[in-house]
């Protein structure tokens, strides 16, 4: 089976949260659920409220966890400027980590004289019905979690392209004269809290995480 | 938004030369190859040669080699092609055309300039 | 030089149909085939390139498909804009060539 991402691309180091009291809230609610026999978790759905049971146990999987997926009672920090941040991920479940930042600096911590290629910007999506799983299948994945009261909303890291040519020739500081360039989204795999049928269901679903220079010969280089 | 402008058709007789320009704008002219294509009436494109207006830097197709030049004007951005020793077969349209990042296509054409060769 | 055969020359479809054209490249470019519509009195405008990927603003009935030395354009809905001629070229190598053209005309 595949793994969920562990990291973030170096430069995008995704801000570690200020511990509050809400960190707990999930921690109680899953406990209070862990002793009835099935838990009943309403789950918002597009605008849709539906009674679903979850096995509280698989929010403590280990394997399951990705700094780029939290459960918050409410939305991450936004930085204004987050070229000062250099905080690292804990080893805290993702849905301990209820302050993170929006990242959206034009590209990763540089010193200075030195450039991205390409530009990236990175925010927290909250706002996510639908993914593509790892089978290239839709799949609908769970906007929020209702555990005693408490909702969760459920965030992604994501991490796309600001622009396909942060120079108008492509890539920034390609020879253009031999080579094609231009910037594009890549992808990576990281388990998300879906619906399967009636049931929550974790499964890997594919979000933006980073953004790369694609480059190929011009045919002046090939002749 | 990127435009490349040609100046207008011209009529030549045999073994005269033409110049057709090619003045480009809305994009760093430096850095991108310019290519030159025509057409004959009723037939496909041939492609004739490119520019590297950076360098000043020529590639010409076998068939053209020696009797057209390629030029660049960094100061108005404009490219040209002239071709001399004119044959009747040269009659065609000719295009200039940028040649993109994606996979050595042209992303954008001139409008064409009618080129007759007649005696 | 890499010789672009290309087919039909010519063809008469109705507003709705899917029209096939291809393009026969003389040896392996790679994926390296690009498709442009032409139109009386219009610029020449870039559809797909590297045989499958959509040019910016072009409309999704436009699509691209093939490798080695067999590509395909397809319009999936035949709209009244798209009367036109349609050119391959190959952006694999110097000389660049193209293919001699397919006229798509009204039924």
């Known amino acids: 089976e595949p793994h969920s991402e562990s990291n973030v691309p170096a430069g995008h180091t995704i801000p570690q949260a200020h511990w509050t009291k809400l960190q707990h809230s999930l921690d109680t609610a899953l406990r209070r659920a862990r002793s009835a026999p099935a838990a009943a978790i309403a789950a918002r759905v597009a605008g849709q409220t539906r009674n679903i049971t979850v096995d509280p146990r698989l929010f403590k999987k280990r394997r399951l966890r990705s700094p780029r997926v939290l459960f918050s009672t409410q939305p991450p920090r936004e930085a204004a400027d987050t070229q000062d941040l250099d905080f690292e991920v804990g080893g805290a479940a993702p849905f301990n980590r209820t302050h993170r930042s929006k990242r959206s600096s034009s590209h990763p911590i540089f010193h200075r004289g030195e450039f991205s290629v390409c530009d990236s910007v990175s925010v927290w999506v909250g706002d996510k019905t639908t993914a593509t799983d790892i089978k290239g299948k839709e799949v609908m994945v769970l906007g929020e979690v209702n555990i005693n009261n408490s909702v969760f909303k459920q965030y992604f890291f994501e991490t796309k392209c600001r622009d396909p040519n942060p120079v108008d020739s492509g890539c920034r500081g390609i020879d253009s004269k031999h080579w094609n360039s231009y910037c594009t989204t890549t992808h990576t795999f990281v388990k998300a809290l879906t619906m399967d049928g009636k049931q929550a269901a974790w499964r890997f679903i594919r979000i933006d995480t980073a953004c790369v220079c694609v480059l190929s010969r011009k045919a002046v280089r090939r002749a | 938004q990127v435009q490349l402008v040609q100046s207008g058709a011209e009529v030549k007789k045999p073994g005269a030369s033409v110049k057709v320009s090619c003045k480009a704008s809305?994009?760093?002219?430096?850095?991108?190859?310019m290519q030159w294509i025509r057409q004959a009436p009723g037939q496909g494109l041939e492609w004739i040669g490119a520019?590297?207006?950076?360098?000043?830097?020529?590639r010409y197709s076998q068939r053209v080699k020696g009797r057209a030049t390629l030029t660049a004007d960094q100061s108005t951005s404009t490219v040209y092609m002239e071709l001399s020793s004119l044959r009747s077969e040269d009659t065609a349209v000719y295009y200039c055309?940028?040649?993109?990042?994606?996979?050595?296509?042209?992303?954008?054409w001139g409008q064409g300039t009618l080129v007759t060769v007649s005696s | 030089d890499i010789q672009m055969t290309q087919s039909p020359s010519s063809l008469s479809a109705s507003v709705g149909d899917r029209v096939t054209i291809t393009c026969r490249p003389s040896q392996d470019i790679g994926n390296h085939l690009n498709w442009y519509q032409q139109k009386p009195g219009k610029t020449v405008k870039l559809l797909i390139y590297?045989?499958?990927r959509l040019y910016s603003g072009v409309p999704s009935r436009f699509s691209g498909s093939g490798s080695g030395t067999d590509y395909t354009l397809t319009i999936s809905s035949l709209q009244p804009e798209d009367f036109a001629t349609y050119f391959c070229h190959q952006g694999y190598t110097l000389p660049y060539t193209f293919g001699q053209g397919t006229k798509v005309e009204i039924k």
């Open positions: 590297f045989t499958s």
């Open positions: 055309a940028r040649e993109g990042n994606f996979a050595n296509s042209f992303d954008y």
């Open positions: 809305g994009y760093t002219f430096s850095r991108y190859w």
């Open positions: 520019i590297y207006p950076g360098d000043g830097d020529t």
